[in-house]
Interface confidence: low
């Protein structure tokens, strides 16, 4: 019988900047019931609090709810891992609410064939961000990625839409029919995850010739291929 | 350093117009809202509105919408607030800022007088 | 839209003295609060945001505090430079609002 082996904090995550939670991996029990208690103090601050609610994310976890929750206060927090033989403490992990967001997927996925008589024909994809995101007052920039494949394809086709919420792509597979899905993460946070995938048959004669191809992908802004510097400082997988 | 440079103010007829330019310097200009707030002289402060990153989304407070519209420039790191059907109430003097991560910054605000 | 209430609109104060000013939020704003302070002829001065985290380069003698509806800003030992408006701001929802103001003069 011994001690409890060290914990780890091992992931803090935000859906919205109003609410976080953390998650520790406990260590080796040591062969003995272990109780395991998360303290923090915020940068600036001497006193210690515990974690206030063990509950809301589950197993070895704590929830820190709206009014535990500052948007830019650095959170310096530690789970402590105490049965009868000893104590055992984690790392100390400094957490920043700002860069620890990561939104629900976007929602209202909506995607569409258009086939304009005097134009090319293209796939129209149109999406909301998630709710509980307050994009208004510009705390927030989300990024968007859309991912498609035919329904037996093996691979995805990636399209980085910026901050758009609609996008056209041009080169699809006549006849196919294919899943679509979206996916969206804030300047500075973690992808959400992918949003449910919506099925599209594309027509049999959708089809292009290169020229018009070429013409397309201009009057489009080129949004397939043209991603600024900012855009891609930003389009990096967490 | 951050620097907020308005400029453009000037005395204006009732019913007139006037273009305030704000020239951004020492962050990241196209990655911030931007916002414009005025204050008439010997009064609080009153925020007129703001613009999002790329132009496409402007909001206002409901004394100007309709009547003034603001734009932005990022490739002149620039900041605009064109005033049409000015008011005598419309007077004071008139400050960009702009709302960092970590707080705002502010010009040092151009005068606007609206007097026939 | 949000209304924001200040208290005192004016206070007289001494060097050295310690002062708190109310501000109060006509609904919850979370703690999407901003304080400023203001000298005469000169723009604002960002103090204090979220609430209560410091400006970067601003005297540990101002503090804030507050989440919800309610919020103060503290000057622990009063400066001669301190002698100021200050305002609260909201930026929960648009538009963004401020106080009224309340004019620290001395005594």
């Known amino acids: 019988q011994l001690p409890p082996g060290k914990p780890e904090i091992f992931k803090c995550r935000s859906p919205n900047k109003e609410t976080f939670t953390c998650w520790w991996r406990p260590g080796t029990d040591g062969g003995l019931p272990t109780n395991y208690s998360l303290t923090y103090h915020r940068e600036g601050e001497t006193l210690m609090h515990e974690c206030p609610d063990y509950i809301t994310g589950g197993p070895n976890s704590c929830h820190f709810g709206k009014q535990y929750t500052s948007m830019w206060r650095t959170y310096i927090m530690m789970v402590n891992a105490t049965n009868q033989m000893g104590s055992s403490f984690s790392d100390e992990l400094y957490v920043d609410v700002t860069y620890i967001v990561q939104p629900d997927p976007p929602l209202e996925l909506a995607v569409e064939v258009k086939q304009p008589e005097d134009r090319k024909p293209y796939l129209w994809i149109k999406w909301s961000p998630p709710t509980l995101i307050d994009l208004k007052t510009g705390w927030f920039t989300l990024l968007y990625e859309i991912r498609l494949k035919p329904e037996k394809a093996a691979e995805w086709e990636i399209h980085f839409a910026g901050q758009q919420t609609e996008f056209k792509i041009l080169s699809l597979h006549p006849g196919q029919k294919y899943l679509v899905q979206v996916r969206c993460k804030p300047d500075h946070g973690y992808w959400s995850a992918w949003s449910p995938a919506t099925f599209i048959q594309i027509p049999s004669d959708f089809t292009m010739n290169d020229e018009q191809k070429l013409i397309s992908e201009e009057d489009l802004g080129g949004e397939q291929k043209l991603i600024s510097e900012e855009d891609l400082h930003h389009h990096h997988h967490h | 350093e951050v620097q907020l440079v308005e400029s453009g103010g000037g005395l204006a007829q009732p019913g007139g117009s006037l273009r305030l330019s704000c020239v951004a310097s020492?962050?990241?200009?196209?990655?911030?809202?931007m916002s414009w707030v005025r204050q008439a002289p010997g009064k609080g402060l009153d925020w007129v509105g703001n613009?999002?990153?790329?132009?496409?989304?402007?909001n206002y407070v409901d004394s100007v919408r309709g009547r003034f519209t603001i734009s932005r420039d990022n490739a002149k790191n620039s900041l605009f607030l064109q005033m049409n059907s000015l008011r005598a109430e419309d007077t004071g003097v008139y400050y960009c800022?702009?709302?960092?991560?970590?707080?705002?910054?502010w010009g040092q605000g151009t005068l606007v007088t609206v007097s026939s | 839209d949000i209304q924001m209430t200040q208290s005192p609109s004016s206070l007289s104060a001494s060097v050295g003295d310690s002062v708190t000013i109310t501000c109060r939020a006509s609904?919850?704003?979370?703690?999407?609060l901003d304080w400023f302070q203001q000298k005469p002829g000169k723009a604002p001065k960002s103090l204090i945001y979220?609430?209560?985290i410091l400006q970067g380069g601003v005297p540990s003698r101002f503090s804030g505090s507050g989440y919800g509806t309610d919020f103060t800003l503290t000057i622990s030992s009063l400066q001669p430079e301190d002698f100021a408006t200050y305002y609260c701001?909201?930026?929960?929802?648009?538009?963004?609002?401020f106080g009224p103001g309340t004019k620290v003069d001395i005594k």
């Open positions: 800022a702009t709302l960092l991560t970590k707080g705002d910054y």
């Open positions: 020492g962050f990241t200009f196209s990655t911030y809202w």
């Open positions: 613009i999002k990153q790329d132009g496409s989304e402007q």
């Open positions: 609904q919850d704003i979370s703690n999407y």
């Open positions: 979220a609430a209560s």
């Open positions: 701001r909201q930026y929960k929802t648009y538009p963004f609002t």
